[in-house]
Amino acid sequence: MMTGTIETTGNISAKKGGSVILQCHLSSTMAQVTQVNWEQHDHSLLAIRNAELGWHIYPAFKDRVAPGPGLGLTLQSLTMNDTGEYFCTYHTYPDGTYRGRIFLEVLESSVAEHSARFQIP
């Protein structure tokens, strides 16, 4: 029934104080996306993008999280505490729920490599 696949930016690294784009993409399904949830490693919700209501950024992250591009999320003013797992959850009809995982490593180094390849988790 669930024919789709989630592609994500996979394992990425970014510099402390910088910004990073978290991106997921759902493909290979006819299902309609009604909502996308973005969660942090401790399962706290960062943001929700509802098809009808648009974006809602949770208050604790309002200053450092920007919606987009697309259904993705931009994290700004990165700190070392931002290191960890991030999850995108796609709620779709009639397939159900698809979930993607991204691991972000925030580096002290001024020469942090920022890799953003797409991969299937």
């Epitope: 029934m1 299902a31 309609q32 009604t34 909502q35 009809y93 009639p94």
Partner: antibody, heavy 122, light 106 residues
Amino acid sequence: EIQLVQSGSELKKPGASVKVSCKASGYTFTSYPMNWVRQAPGQGLEWMGWINTNTGNPTNAQGFTGRFVFSLDTSVSTAYLQISSLKAEDTAVYYCARVGGYGGYDYAFDIWGQGTMVTVSS
Amino acid sequence: DIQLTQSPSFLSASVGDRVTITCRASQGISSYLAWYQQKPGKAPKLLIYAASTLQSGVPSRFSGSGSGTEFTLTISSLQPEDFATYYCQQLNSYPTFGGGTKLEIK
């Protein structure tokens, strides 16, 4: 007010075609999937299929392929059901129904059209 | 396809009665179940979704329970306007409806 308003009753001869419309108002049409449900006289509800209102991709349920076509005109927030080569057994009330809920367990058909009676008789 | 079997098909009851309708799924559907009420000549109306969540505006005498393969719709105290046909629907995969339960006045 959120509502779905369907076109009026139709009387058709066998072999003819019919196109039923379902006009949405009070919400963003492209944000919610649309379903079609058939109810033959004195019978229960049968899910016919659905259309992705964002992409226009239709999906037909088993038993409703070939002669049954779902389409959209997003500019007027309207979904359509076209049935070709009508048969007497197509006589039924046809409903459009929106999928409400953000996702997960919350999905359900929260808004229904009033129904369109299609009678096929020679 | 997932089949839903409703029981009973017909139910006679009186105003004030407590009634229970059962819906059994041919395989586990977690809580992906909704209940609808339909009156003659009218479109179905959503009563309950997610097996037990009451739709906005629906009286609290209606309640739903269950998970997996067995679900129930309960009306705690029947009112005259409750005499109608009730359908369960699964949304775990492509939707299907139960055969319906016609609730009649005794």
